[in-house]
């Protein structure tokens, strides 16, 4: 009786359980009553991932360095090529299909997370006690000065722009 | 039944063509690569050219074979073809339709080419 | 091409001895070498795929052995019916490049 359903990494051909082809190899040839299936390897710019009956191999990622990519991970015969962005760049998608440049924390934001290849910058308004007063994609919110510890006493209050202005406390004669 | 069946041979005059076929039976066409082989009277075998498995048309021929011979299918009537053009005297053959492409699992009876004048 | 150079051409052998047959490959093939026994007026049927991978109903004394350029086939104690010649097919790719290469041929002929 010819089955109807085969075991894990096997797939049903001609009334025939064949074995899938592994990751990195590519189906050539269907199982015989004589022989198993045949599979070749994938050559240096493809890959498979799975266990499969592909006839073809998947073509490599390229990291266009136009879109200002670059090789992160090189791909195998079991892998794809991972991506990622230039210096100062990140990308647009989980798939990293093209890059952005990093954007900058306007004056009243501090950075919370730095940049990666993959993620953009995150900022966050600067608290009550903080400012920021540059466009930065790398500077935190800055303390305001603190005017006791330099025996002086503030003369402008600070904004989560500016920092606060000290000056010399009034003496009385 | 799994079988190849060539036909298309016969006395062909030097300078001619011939189109090969091998009809397949009993297996999906589409997920096998295959290939020609042939064999002149009392002598070895030789390979001539593969295609390989899926619908893209990638193919593979033996250095001599270039230019001359053509290895083609029609997945729809599971039929491999082999054009041969400017036939010599040397490619009088045996020729054989094989399953496979690092190994030749299944095989036809073959069809004999003579080129003669 | 690959060139597949086969030895011995012919050999003269009796019921019952251990015949070996050498194959060589003209460049590395890994271990995509294969057997074949062909019988007159037959096509050629296949022994042995992957260097040593016995075709299903393939009697064990027949075995192969070898990796890269050099390979052998095995008949542990000859039987009648394996009076016939014998081929061994290397398989070679690289990126762009597929070739597949035979013997010339090893006759087994009865002593």
């Known amino acids: 009786e010819p089955p109807t359903a085969c075991r894990e990494k096997q797939y049903l051909i001609n009334s025939q359980c064949c074995s899938l082809c592994q990751p990195g190899q590519k189906l050539v040839s269907d199982c015989t009553e004589f022989t198993e299936t045949e599979c070749l390897p994938c050559s240096e710019s493809e890959f498979l991932d799975t266990w499969n009956r592909e006839t073809r191999c998947h073509q490599h990622k390229y990291c266009d360095p136009n879109l200002g990519l670059q090789v992160q991970q090189k791909g195998t015969s079991e892998t794809d090529t991972i991506c990622t962005c230039e210096e100062g760049l990140h990308c647009t998608s989980e798939s990293c299909e093209s890059c952005v440049p990093h954007r900058s924390c306007l004056p009243g934001f501090g950075v919370k997370q730095i940049a990666t290849g993959v993620s953009d910058t995150i900022c966050e308004p600067c608290p009550v006690g903080f400012f920021s007063n540059v466009s930065s994609a790398f500077e935190k919110c800055r303390p305001w000065t603190s005017c006791e510890t330099k025996d002086l006493v503030v003369q402008q209050a600070g904004t989560n722009k500016t920092d606060v202005v000290c000056g010399p406390q009034d003496r009385q004669r | 039944e799994v079988q190849l069946e060539e036909s298309g041979g016969g006395l062909v005059q030097p300078g001619g063509s011939l189109r090969l076929s091998c009809a397949a039976s009993?297996?999906?066409?589409?997920?096998?690569?295959m290939c020609w082989v042939r064999q002149a009277p009392g002598k070895g075998l030789e390979w001539v050219a593969c295609?390989?498995?899926?619908?893209?048309?990638?193919?593979y021929y033996a250095s001599w074979a270039k230019g001359r011979f053509t290895i083609s299918k029609d997945t729809s009537k599971t039929t491999l073809y082999l054009q041969m053009n400017s036939l010599r005297a040397e490619d009088t053959a045996v020729y054989f339709c094989?399953?496979?492409?690092?190994?030749?699992?299944?095989w036809g009876q073959g069809t004999l080419v003579t080129v003669s004048s | 091409d690959i060139v597949m150079t086969q030895s011995p051409s012919s050999l003269s052998a009796s019921v019952g001895d251990r015949v070996t047959i050498t194959c060589q490959a003209s460049?590395?093939?890994?271990?995509?070498l294969s057997w074949y026994q062909q019988k007159p007026g037959q096509a050629p049927k296949l022994l042995i795929y992957l260097t040593s991978t016995l075709a299903s109903g393939v009697p064990s004394r027949f075995s192969g052995s070898g990796s890269g350029t050099d390979f052998t086939l095995t008949i542990s104690s000859l039987q009648p019916e394996d009076f016939a010649t014998y081929y061994c097919?290397?398989?070679?790719?690289?990126?762009?490049?597929?070739?597949?290469?035979f013997g010339q041929g090893t006759k087994v002929v009865i002593k």
């Open positions: 094989a399953r496979g492409l690092s190994r030749f699992a299944l």
């Open positions: 460049q590395s093939i890994s271990s995509y």
């Open positions: 009993g297996f999906d066409f589409s997920t096998n690569a």
């Open positions: 097919q290397g398989y070679y790719s690289s990126s762009s490049y597929v070739s597949n290469g």
């Open positions: 295609i390989a498995a899926g619908s893209s048309i990638i193919t």
